[in-house]
Interface confidence: medium
């Protein structure tokens, strides 16, 4: 059974992940971002179901495409400190949260999504899990 300390750790990790995803989304949604039109043309895969931590497998599988899109979108008015580091940090958190005991085959929805919809989906996921923990 999960202890209060492990629950607290999970909560902190989810909050960190949430902040990272929100930071990316805020950068993208910045009205001064001249690359938004182009970024919105890259389609991301969305999870059919995302209700448990193990479903973060679906986010993990989309981190490489996310990194590439963010790299391509860098401009004077949209600049993330270090995309590689940021994605690497997200990856570490995701791996810890989802655990490695069970290897889940991610099931994707038929509909694809823009980067904004993709990020919003995973932000909602984090918020939902955090609320159950608190």
């Amino acid at each position: 059974a999960p202890t209060s300390s492990s629950t607290k750790k999970t909560q902190l990790q989810l909050e960190h992940l949430l902040l990272d995803l929100q930071m990316i989304l805020n950068g993208i949604n910045n009205y001064k971002n001249p690359k938004l039109t182009r970024m919105l043309t890259f389609k991301f895969y969305m999870p059919k179901k995302a209700t448990e931590l193990r479903h973060l497998q679906c986010l993990e599988e989309e981190l490489k495409p996310l990194e590439e899109v963010l790299n391509l979108a860098q401009s004077k008015s949209f600049h993330l400190r270090d995309t590689k580091d940021l994605i690497s940090n997200i990856n570490v958190i995701v791996l810890e949260l989802k655990g490695s005991e069970t290897t889940l085959m991610c099931e994707y929805a038929d509909e694809t999504a823009t980067i904004v919809e993709f990020l919003n989906r995973w932000i909602t996921f984090c918020q939902s899990i955090i609320s159950t923990l608190t």
Epitope: P34, R38, F42, K43, P65, E68, T112
Partner: antibody, heavy 124, light 107 residues
Framework: EVQLVQSGAEVKKPGESLKISCKGS????????IGWVRQMPGKGLEWMGI????????KYSPSFQGQVTISADKSISTAYLQWSSLKASDTAMYYC?????????????????WGQGTAVTVSS | DIQMTQSPSSLSASVGDRVTITCQAS??????LNWYQQKPGKAPKFLIY???NLETGVPSRFSGSGSGTDFFFTISNLQPEDIATYFC?????????FGPGTKVDIK
């Protein structure tokens, strides 16, 4: 080999309808935007619009919005361009082209693979 | 819509010459500019993306440069097979507009 094969030349009368096709092969058709480009006789290239076959998301140039319909059938890896009522001014060569991509998915960086073109002649 | 202009509209040069075509955008498009080659009766061919990146398999005598609103396309050593019309295209903002083209032929 990645390729786009278009349907054959068409000769139509003003007011008739028409649907031309573009079949993709050699790559994951659902993951790449397909664009349509018009070239009137002796003229330059005009970007008409694009479709993402994976979810049928479609974007039109304002010049062509309402004039044509772009669609796709992902089950047969085919994109379409159609007119409900042709005009003489629709006489042109129409090309379909794939937008290149990264991570095995489309992210506009130019149209890297082109169909051979479909000549459409509208004359009474 | 972003307007694209090209100059010259046509040019004639000798085999071995260095040829440069200019493309101008009506607003800043960063480096989101592509170049295509179209030979008579054929479909366009993709040459350069993002202003200066050569598409795989394109001869190194072709090159591109520029950013913002001003772009350049150069053929460093003109060959007979380079006789074609060259088009620039912006893909920074929808709709993705083409330049009117520059026709290149041999003297």
């Amino acid at each position: 080999e990645v390729q786009l094969v278009q349907s054959g030349a068409e000769v139509k009368k003003p007011g008739e309808s028409l649907k031309i096709s573009c079949k993709g092969s050699g790559y994951r058709f659902t993951n790449y935007w397909i664009g349509w480009v018009r070239q009137m006789p002796g003229k330059g290239l005009e970007w008409m619009g694009i479709i993402y076959p994976g979810d049928s998301d479609t974007k039109y140039s304002p010049s062509f919005q309402g004039q044509v319909t772009i669609s796709a059938d992902k089950s047969i890896s085919t994109a379409y361009l159609q007119w409900s009522s042709l005009k003489a001014s629709d006489t042109a060569m129409y090309y379909c082209a794939r937008h290149g991509g990264y991570s095995g998915r489309s992210y506009y960086y130019g149209m890297d693979v082109w169909g051979q073109g479909t000549a459409v002649t509208v004359s009474s | 819509d972003i307007q694209m202009t090209q100059s010259p509209s046509s040019l004639s040069a000798s085999v071995g010459d260095r040829v440069t075509i200019t493309c101008q955008a009506s607003q800043d498009i960063s480096n989101y500019l592509n170049w295509y080659q179209q030979k008579p009766g054929k479909a366009p061919k993709f040459l350069i993306y993002d202003a200066s990146n050569l598409e795989t398999g394109v001869p190194s005598r072709f090159s591109g440069s520029g950013s913002g609103t001003d772009f350049f396309f150069t053929i460093s050593n003109l060959q007979p097979e380079d006789i074609a019309t060259y088009f620039c295209q912006q893909d920074d903002n929808l709709p993705f507009t083409f330049g009117p083209g520059t026709k290149v032929d041999i003297k």
